[in-house]
């Protein structure tokens, strides 16, 4: 669709005569009839296939024609067409004399024609005017013409329709050739696709308007490039949504089981060495001078009763010192100057002479020991307590203080981990040397049968448009990770249609 425009500029008829040569009385009151038609090698009469237009009386004899486009649009003359401009045309311009006010063809005498010109040729669509001048024996006509496209029509033939818009169906203006020019922030063939926030992850994020970044399920962060771990994940991370990959030293489905008690809790005191020995289990190796499960008890060096023959022990900063009874000497009072005559055996011990009376030996009653039967038997010296238990002398007897997880007189019994019914959902518990194991009934899994093993929610292929399906173990549901251009809980909506989120 377009308009052929004809601008009449000057008409010269100096003698004021008609085509017949007869003069007009009193002068030639001149108006024009224009016929636009398809290209003809020889312009002949017939229908004006592209349109016709007439002017009012524009002047008498010779006159210039005023540009009147602003005041009513009479000059240039408009010949609209609603078809593809063919690029060629024929044009007939007739100048007529109007004796009266009625300009209809049937109201004029046939000899009222002043002049007639006919041209034909090629004409491309464009803003520039083509100037032309046609001269006959008695008259001269100067004019210019052009073809322009109607509003919203573009291209070499005015055949391309383009109407700027900024709505759901597109966000663009039109280029001179009719191609779309997207408004800032929009892209795509029809400028319907928003340009997301710079850096927004192509798969994990999307947008419904420019410069935003909306995250698909399981992703978060300004650019939707951070995955959300499995709900309940305590000491773990993810590389894809709903994962729980445990940090160093943690285990279990939710990474909530402490496998590195030594590092996380530092239970061993006084510079002892800590060794992990299972979940929440550890062993402390004490430095000299310390004892106890956590090496929390300071040992006196005299506790080992190093002084013999009734010597008394005194603690010193750099060790101990033995004060020997009369008749004995040496670091531990181990050397004797006595004989049986001096009654050296204590606690009812019997004395036996040796080396012709130069020496002696004591035979001690039960519960006593030492070269002079001066020491009570330490029932702990044989380390009777198993599994790292601590031995304590209690008068004539002894007892073992057991580490957590052990019981019995000598800490020889492993406390049953199954006693507290740790297996969920009717799981069967089995005691192991270093912990326990649950045998789960159908439909449950995990270390403690705490995880409901669902039918794979993704088995029915619920996601559309080649989306990736994830099963959310905590809820027995699926999550669809949509490819670019689709949204919705099943990726069923192309971007542009309003999705409904379950927020």
């Amino acid at each position: 669709s377009g308009v052929f425009q004809l601008q009449l500029q000057e008409f010269i008829n100096e003698r004021g005569v008609l085509a017949s040569g007869r003069p007009c009385e009193p002068g030639c009151r001149t108006f024009f009839r224009v016929c636009l038609k398809h290209f003809q090698a020889v312009v002949s009469p017939g229908p004006c296939t592209f349109g016709t237009v007439s002017t009012p009386v524009l002047g008498t004899n010779s006159f210039a024609v005023r540009d009147d486009s602003s005041g009513g649009g009479r000059n240039p003359l408009q010949l609209p067409f609603n078809f593809t401009w063919p690029g060629t045309f024929s044009l007939i311009i007739e100048a007529w004399h109007a004796p009266g006010d009625d300009l209809r063809p049937e109201a004029l005498p046939p000899d009222a024609l002043i002049s007639k010109i006919a041209i034909q040729g090629s004409l491309a669509v464009g803003q520039n005017w083509l100037l032309d001048e046609q001269t006959s024996t008695l008259t001269r006509l100067r004019y210019s013409y052009r073809v322009i496209c109607s509003d919203n029509y573009y291209g070499d033939n005015c055949s391309r329709l383009c109407k700027k818009r900024n709505d759901h169906f597109g966000h663009y203006v039109c280029q001179p050739d009719g191609n779309l020019s997207c408004l800032p922030g929009w892209t795509g063939e029809y400028c319907q696709q928003p340009i997301c926030l710079s850096g927004c992850h192509e798969q994990n994020g999307y947008c419904s308007k420019p410069a935003e970044c909306l995250c698909r399920p399981g992703w978060q962060g300004r650019l939707c490039n951070e995955c959300i771990p499995h709900n309940g994940c305590r000491h773990g991370t993810c590389s894809t949504p709903w994962q729980c990959t445990c940090d160093e030293g943690w285990g279990g489905l939710f990474c909530d089981q402490d496998l590195n008690y030594c590092t996380h809790h530092s239970p061993c005191k006084n510079g002892a060495t800590c060794s992990n020995s299972g979940q929440r289990s550890y062993t402390c190796t004490c430095r000299p001078g310390y004892t106890g499960v956590d090496c929390e008890l300071e040992l006196s060096e005299c506790d080992s009763n190093p002084c013999r023959n009734g010597g008394s022990c005194k603690d010193q900063e750099d060790g101990y010192h033995c004060l020997c009874p009369p008749g004995y000497y040496g670091l531990h009072c181990e050397h004797s100057t006595l004989s049986c005559a001096d009654s050296p055996c204590f606690n009812g011990g019997s004395c036996r002479e040796r080396n012709q009376g130069a020496n002696y030996a004591c035979e001690c009653p039960p519960n006593f020991t030492g070269s002079n039967c001066e020491k009570k038997v330490d029932r702990c010296t044989s380390n009777p307590c198993a599994n790292g238990g601590q031995c304590l002398n209690r008068g004539p007897s002894r007892m073992c203080r057991c580490r957590p997880g052990f019981t019995g007189t000598y800490c020889e019994l492993h406390v049953s981990d199954c006693a507290r019914n740790p297996c969920a959902h009717g799981g069967t518990c089995h005691d192991l040397e270093n912990g326990l194991m649950c045998t789960c009934p159908a439909g449950f899994s995990g270390r403690r049968c705490e995880v409901r093993t669902s039918i794979d929610a993704c088995a029915s292929s619920p996601c559309f448009n080649r989306a990736t399906c994830y099963t959310d173990l905590s809820t027995d549901t699926f999550v669809c990770n949509c490819p670019y251009g689709f949204v919705g809980s099943r990726c069923e909506f192309p971007v542009g249609l309003p999705p409904s989120f379950p927020w």
Epitope: A211, L214, Q220, H230, W503
Partner: nanobody, 123 residues
Framework: EVQLVESGGGLVQAGGSLRLSCAAS????????MSWVRQAPGKGPEWVSA????????YYADLVKGRFTISRDNAKNTLYLQMNSLKPEDTAVYYC????????????????WGQGTQVTVSS
């Protein structure tokens, strides 16, 4: 069920301070980015501040930059907003929310909201 419960709002003189808290439950708080949003009477929701899941990255709207501080305690499942040098134009209902969409300046679409706590700053 996801629950976000705000507290700490009240009436304060211009130039004063308040500390808002948001107690979270029903989800693994330490795995999610969190945000504060406010809504003044007769106006739409306005993003105030946001913090990433670990607490190391914070974001602030221009209007509150330098006056408000967002923080979180993942062990206590709690989000905080320390508001200093308060102005009458800070009067609004303040919500804590889980963001799920970002615009050029900050979060603008949210998965869950709390019920809000009223902050009134008098001149």
């Amino acid at each position: 069920e996801v629950q976000l419960v705000e507290s700490g709002g009240g009436l304060v003189q211009a130039g004063g301070s308040l500390r808002l808290s948001c107690a979270a439950s029903g989800f693994t708080f330490g795995s999610y980015d969190m945000s504060w949003v406010r809504q003044a009477p007769g106006k739409g929701p306005e993003w105030v501040s946001a913090i990433n899941s670990g607490g190391g990255i914070t974001y602030y709207a221009d209007l509150v930059k330098g006056r408000f501080t967002i923080s979180r305690d993942n062990a206590k499942n709690t989000l905080y907003l320390q508001m200093n040098s308060l102005k009458p134009e800070d009067t609004a209902v303040y919500y804590c929310a889980i963001p799920r969409g970002w615009g050029p300046t900050g979060p603008h679409e949210y998965g869950y909201w709390g019920q809000g706590t009223q902050v009134t700053v008098s001149s």
